[in-house]
């Protein structure tokens, strides 16, 4: 799935429009596909293709549907109970639920290593040392370079997910 949920990504708290379905909360909670009204008396349905909720909740809002970033393909559309599912395009990857954008898979393994895993939408190619069989993943550091990890750039202007 793609795109980060930020404070701006929540569907605004709003009174139910006449066409929005209402039902009563169960044990104070509303089912997936709904959020609770401000007075707590009603469950208001999320709007198909616009926002969603995945779990029983007493939230005053539904979460806004993700729009897939460029470099991603839409696997399934947003429904009232499930967010859009986006996947990195062929030749790129992002670890599942990582906040990073899709990154290009490496084209080959460093010297002395052999490829044992292909590029997938959620993982880079996997390399192991020829002799020891130990795994190597991530960028290939220059000789003597210290390897540190740093967070990736967040997805573009925070289109929303859940």
């Amino acid at each position: 799935e793609s795109a980060l949920i930020t404070q701006q990504d929540l569907a605004p708290q709003q009174r139910a429009a006449p066409q929005q379905k209402r039902s009563s909360p169960s044990e104070g909670l509303c089912p997936p596909g709904h959020h609770i009204s401000e007075d707590g008396r009603d469950c208001i349905s999320c709007k198909y293709g616009q926002d969603y909720s995945t779990h029983w909740n007493d939230l005053l809002f539904c979460l806004r549907c993700t729009r897939c970033d460029s470099g991603e393909v839409e696997l399934s559309p947003c429904t009232t109970t499930r967010n859009t599912v986006c996947q990195c395009e062929e030749g790129t990857f992002r670890e599942e639920d990582s906040p990073e954008m899709c990154r290009k898979c490496r084209t080959g393994c460093p010297r002395g290593m052999v490829k044992v895993g292909d590029c997938t939408p959620w993982s880079d190619i996997e390399c192991v040392h020829k002799e020891s069989g130990t795994k190597h993943s991530g960028e290939v550091p220059a000789v003597e370079e210290t390897v540190t990890s740093s967070p990736g750039t967040p997805a573009s202007p925070c289109s929303l997910s859940g």
Partner: nanobody, 124 residues
């Protein structure tokens, strides 16, 4: 990044109640996504509940719906998990988590700050 320190937990009987606390420090929590997860021995870390620091309400996993409640105390910068009518299957290490932005709110991978974990054991 936010630092999270948990307290509460322990050994209780089935049907009892327990409250876990998660105190945050390091920065203001305005707009932060907060969640509780749990991990039973030999199992994956699973979603329990989720909310946003400065907005009312929470979302709950089916397994805890109607028994667990998430709340916040702004003055104490603390998030609580009130657990009622505990069952033996609630036995796990419970973790609170926080992030300024999340990709999938019910996935542990979406959170960058974690509490140290609190053991909850429910005996029959």
């Amino acid at each position: 990044e936010v630092q999270l320190v948990q307290s509460g937990g322990g050994l209780v009987q089935a049907g009892d109640s327990l409250r876990l606390s998660c105190a945050a420090s390091g920065r203001a929590l305005t707009g932060y996504h907060m969640a509780w997860f749990r991990q039973a021995p030999g199992k994956e870390r699973e979603f329990v509940t989720y909310g946003i620091w400065d907005r009312a309400g929470a979302a709950y996993a089916d397994s805890v719906k109607g028994r667990f409640t998430m709340s916040r105390d702004n003055a104490k910068n603390t998030v609580y998990l009130q657990m009622n009518n505990l069952k033996t299957e609630d036995t796990a290490v419970y973790y609170c988590a926080a992030s300024m932005a999340v990709r999938t709110y019910y996935s542990p991978r979406s959170y960058d700050s974690w509490g140290q974990g609190t053991q909850v054991t429910v005996s029959s």
